[in-house]
């Protein structure tokens, strides 16, 4: 058959939850301390909460069924009677009472024909302001007749026909009734919620609703123009040209900021936005949702997209509607012919209307922003240059911030890219130019996106001119090739000698993408003597083992995820893992990760890695490779300092010569 509607699916779930109590029993969730009841979907069932309020489960007959004394559940279908009597069956006795008062309407409800009645519950009538109720029942009851006819449709309409955004023609002057059928199974009629649906009658169907509904006459734009509280909004809409859309056809939700909402914004920010047509348009579009969203539809947090493209979290807390967790809606469900308005008393400024400074204020990067300010780079963060700011998280500076000297200033300039980027368009191997003149490389991994050693830690915030990338560490631009890095660090003197002996110097000096796991001098010294001698005594073996320390792509620690198998130049794969922020290679911890080079990255290790297939080498002739001899001397374990090793005299002389 046809796909079930959300309402029917929720009803089916409630029926499922109630079936252990007998046939046609539905589980209903009642919000504690109120009379609000809901058929329950899966999520609500397990959370036992609606709008953050606890619920109790009760079991009732599903719509259309009743109990039979002495039998389990609700085995009997309700007897069909006319619409008037069915109002009593669903508990809408006040509607019956007012129907009687009109004189004309009861005969219609009891007579031939086919009608749909959206019948307000007794509580709905009782909650009407006294003056409204008085006006309905005076004037020879004509207003009451009109109000009741507005709740009626001249044909049978069941919930499976109630589609989201449709309009029904009422029996009062053919005025429209707005129907919304939400994915969570809630159905609203002019924003009144369907409480009990599809109660069949001989001459139609009754749906019980939680409010008395009234005709809708104005569009959104007209409401803005009428209300004094929207004076600033009115001016902003006029300036942006959005009035055409807001008076046209469609179904929108306007989260309408009151004058008070605009007053809360610093005048400098407000004037900047109001004076910038694009920022203003984005600001207003951020208050408009693409479809009508009634307050009754919200029973839990819901992500909605604004016309500007930002996602808002609309939720509720008891009777209050919230946006992004804040109860800023002061008046809800003001119906317009083209949607619904909720008054809000805080402005929702989208990122697209903000400066980099403003973006950063809401991110966890305040320490970095202070550094940029102190370094005299503030004008770049508030101006109209197209830039991308790479701002490290506050946690990066937990051990303190660097002094603002020339080096720091330069480092910070290399955290500002000369273009407004979006991370979704970045690609592996792309180079980005900084204000400091450096070229930074982009590395795209399965679960992360990194720029040099620093990876993006949060979604981009794309501002009016600048984009903020929140980074997981201070970015260090490369200062030379891998070989330059190793030569410039005395921890690697033995590795450098080994690389030279193995003929790998050129490889690590040329353009390329390498990940080098660099054993320190201590790592070489820590080798058992036998392994050390095997390494030093065979140039082929040495090259083989060194190549096993070189991955054939750039892998920074932020790109590791849980486990990466990195192919080495030797052919075997290296198992690189990240656990509790510690990088390991072949289960051995890396002492210092991410020393960037122009042709790769160096990770410092304190052990020499052994390839899995490192079988004992066949005996070969004694090598006459002079580079190897030099390495053997350099490695006499760079130990003029290590007292228990002494070079044979002939080589001691050679070393002396090499020193001069």
């Amino acid at each position: 058959g046809p796909a079930k509607s959300p309402y029917q699916l929720v009803l089916q779930h409630s029926r499922l939850r109630g079936r252990q109590h007998g046939p046609n029993v539905c589980a209903v969730q009642k919000v504690i301390g109120t009379n609000r009841k809901y058929f329950t979907n899966c999520k609500q069932w397990y959370q036992r909460k609606i709008c953050g309020k606890s619920t109790v489960i009760s079991y009732e007959c599903c719509p259309g069924y009743e109990k039979v004394p002495g039998e389990k559940g609700c085995p009997a279908a309700l007897p069909l009677s006319n619409l008037y009597e069915t109002l009593g069956v669903v508990g809408s006795t006040t509607t019956q009472l007012y129907t009687d008062r009109t004189e004309k309407l009861r005969p219609e409800m009891e007579g031939p024909g086919s009608f749909t009645i959206f019948a307000p519950s007794n509580e709905a009538w009782a909650s009407l302001p006294a003056e409204v109720l008085d006006s309905l029942v005076s004037n020879v009851n004509i207003e009451l007749l009109n109000a009741l006819r507005y709740h009626m449709v001249g044909r049978r309409v069941l919930t499976d026909e109630l589609k989201h955004g449709m309009t029904l023609t009422s029996m009062y002057q053919n005025s429209n009734i707005q129907i919304h059928h939400y994915p969570n199974g809630i159905v609203t009629v002019n924003c009144a919620r369907l409480l009990k649906a599809d109660h069949h009658a001989t001459n139609g169907v009754v749906h019980l609703i939680d409010k008395v509904i009234s005709t809708i006459t104005n569009n959104i734009q007209q409401i803005i123009e009428i209300e004094d509280t929207f004076e600033t909004l009115r001016a902003a809409v006029a300036a942006s040209g959005l009035n055409t859309m807001l008076e046209g056809n469609g179904q929108y939700t306007l989260l309408a900021p009151t004058n008070e909402a605009f007053e809360k914004i610093p005048s400098e920010t407000l004037n900047r936005i109001l004076g910038d047509p694009e920022a203003l348009r984005d600001l207003l579009n951020n208050h408009i949702l693409k479809s009508a969203m009634c307050a009754e539809a919200i029973v839990a947090g819901l992500s909605v997209e604004t016309l500007e493209g930002t996602t808002l979290e609309v939720g509720c807390s008891g009777d209050m509607l919230t946006i992004n967790g804040k109860a800023i809606i002061s008046n809800k469900d003001i119906l317009a012919t083209n949607g619904v308005i909720h008054y809000i008393d805080e402005l929702l400024i989208p990122d697209s209307a903000k400066t980099l400074f403003e973006l950063a204020a809401e991110s966890d990067v305040s320490t970095a922003i202070d550094l940029f300010r102190q370094a005299g780079l503030g004008n770049h963060l508030s101006g109209s240059e197209r830039l991308t700011l790479l701002a490290p998280l506050n946690s990066v500076f937990k051990d303190g911030t660097p002094p603002i000297d020339a080096h720091t200033r330069n480092l910070l300039r290399n955290h500002i890219i000369k273009d407004q980027l979006a991370s979704k368009y970045l690609y592996h191997g792309q180079t980005l130019e900084t204000l400091g003149g450096k070229k930074l490389r982009v590395f795209v991994y399965r679960n992360s996106l990194c720029i040099e050693n620093s990876c993006i830690a949060a979604h981009d915030k794309r501002g009016r001119y600048g984009t903020l990338f929140t980074m997981d560490r201070v970015l260090t631009p490369p200062m030379g090739t891998v070989m330059d890095v190793l030569k410039g660090d005395n921890r690697f003197s033995m590795l450098v000698a080994a690389i030279q002996s193995a003929g790998l110097t050129e490889t690590l000096n040329r353009e390329g993408v390498y990940t080098v796991f660099a054993p320190t001098n201590e790592a070489f010294r820590a080798l058992p003597p036998r392994e050390r001698s095997r390494l030093l005594g065979d140039a082929k073996e040495l090259a083989n083992i060194l190549k096993y320390h070189i991955g054939d792509e750039i892998l920074v620690s932020g790109g590791i995820g849980a486990l990466v198998r990195l192919k080495s130049l030797q052919g075997d794969k290296l198992e690189v893992s990240l656990k509790n922020n510690v990088v390991s290679v072949n289960k051995e911890p890396v002492a210092e990760p991410d020393i960037m080079a122009t042709n790769g990255v160096v990770h410092v290790i304190t052990n020499v890695l052994q390839p899995p297939a490192n079988r004992p080498q066949e005996r070969g002739d004694e090598l006459a490779d002079s580079a190897l001899e030099i390495f053997k001397q350099a490695s006499a374990f760079s130990r003029a300092s290590q007292r228990s090793v002494r070079l044979a005299p002939v080589y001691q002389k050679l070393l002396e010569r090499m020193k001069h």
């Epitope: 058992p528 003597p529 392994e531 001698s533 005594g537 005996r619 004694e622 006499a636 044979a648």
Partner: antibody, heavy 120, light 113 residues
Framework: QVQLVQSGAEVKKPGSSVKVSCKAS????????MYWVRQAPGQGLEWVGT????????YYAQKVQGRFTITRDSSTSTLYLELSSLRSEDTAVYYC?????????????WGQGTTVTVSS | DIVMTQSPDSLAVSLGERATMNCKSS????????????LAWYQQKPGQPPKLLIY???TRESGVPDRFSGSGSGTDFTLTISSLQAEDVAVYYC?????????FGQGTKLEIK
């Protein structure tokens, strides 16, 4: 078969020097690490020093560092241990030992030993 | 330095019986990269140089009778002679070649009961 023939016994005074030799045969001398191990009278074994297959570097026990020198001569397949600044505690049988292969390893083949006595 | 400690210092076993001696190192001799234990066992008979019996803690040197076996890993090692023969009377030494300086145990003297 592998043979390591060591020079004869030596009696020396404290502070003097002596050079002990070990002539190898039955294998390619330059393909092996070589070692000296000593054993004081009634005592256990003590490693003295190592020389690599090509004679490029030598390792020494702390006790003898700076006083003893190990050298090798591939042309004559001979290993040497020069003991200088002798002390009475250097009295021991000195064994010339061949490693397992061309890499630093365990002590595979032993010479018959040379007794060095240091006494005033 | 790695300290090697053998136990017992001396051992008397009847001919044909099993003889077991232990060797403990002050730090692990297992090299994780190749999962090998850098330990050897030697036999020294009176007036003779020592003779290699076992290397890699459990690999028997060629020509060594199969009644000799080595076991253990990390810091605890054992040399076992499954059925003692008269010619097995000697002092047995363990030795580590995991780190310089290479060190020996003090020896276990094996006698016939």
């Amino acid at each position: 078969q592998v043979q390591l023939v060591q020079s004869g016994a030596e009696v020396k005074k404290p502070g003097s020097s002596v050079k002990v030799s070990c002539k190898a045969s039955g294998f390619t001398f330059s393909d092996y690490y070589m070692y000296w191990v000593r054993q004081a009278p009634g005592q256990g074994l003590e490693w003295v020093g190592t020389i690599s297959d090509g004679g490029i570097y030598a390792y020494y026990a702390q006790k003898v560092q700076g006083r003893f020198t190990i050298t090798r001569d591939s042309s004559t397949s001979t290993l040497y241990l020069e003991l200088s600044s002798l002390r009475s505690e250097d009295t021991a049988v000195y064994y010339c030992v061949r490693g397992w292969d061309r890499y630093d390893s365990w002590f595979a083949c032993w010479g018959q030993g040379t007794t060095v006595t240091v006494s005033s | 330095d790695i300290v090697m400690t053998q136990s017992p210092d001396s051992l008397a076993v009847s001919l044909g019986e099993r003889a077991t001696m232990n060797c403990k190192s002050s730090q692990s001799l297992l090299y994780s990269s190749n999962q090998k234990n850098y330990l050897a066992w030697y036999q020294q008979k009176p007036g003779q140089p020592p003779k290699l019996l076992i290397y890699w803690a459990s690999t028997r040197e060629s020509g060594v009778p199969d009644r000799f076996s080595g076991s253990g890993s990390g810091t605890d090692f054992t040399l076992t002679i499954s059925s003692l023969q008269a010619e097995d009377v000697a002092v047995y030494y363990c030795q580590q070649y995991y780190r310089y300086p290479y060190t020996f145990g003090q020896g276990t003297k094996l006698e016939i009961k």
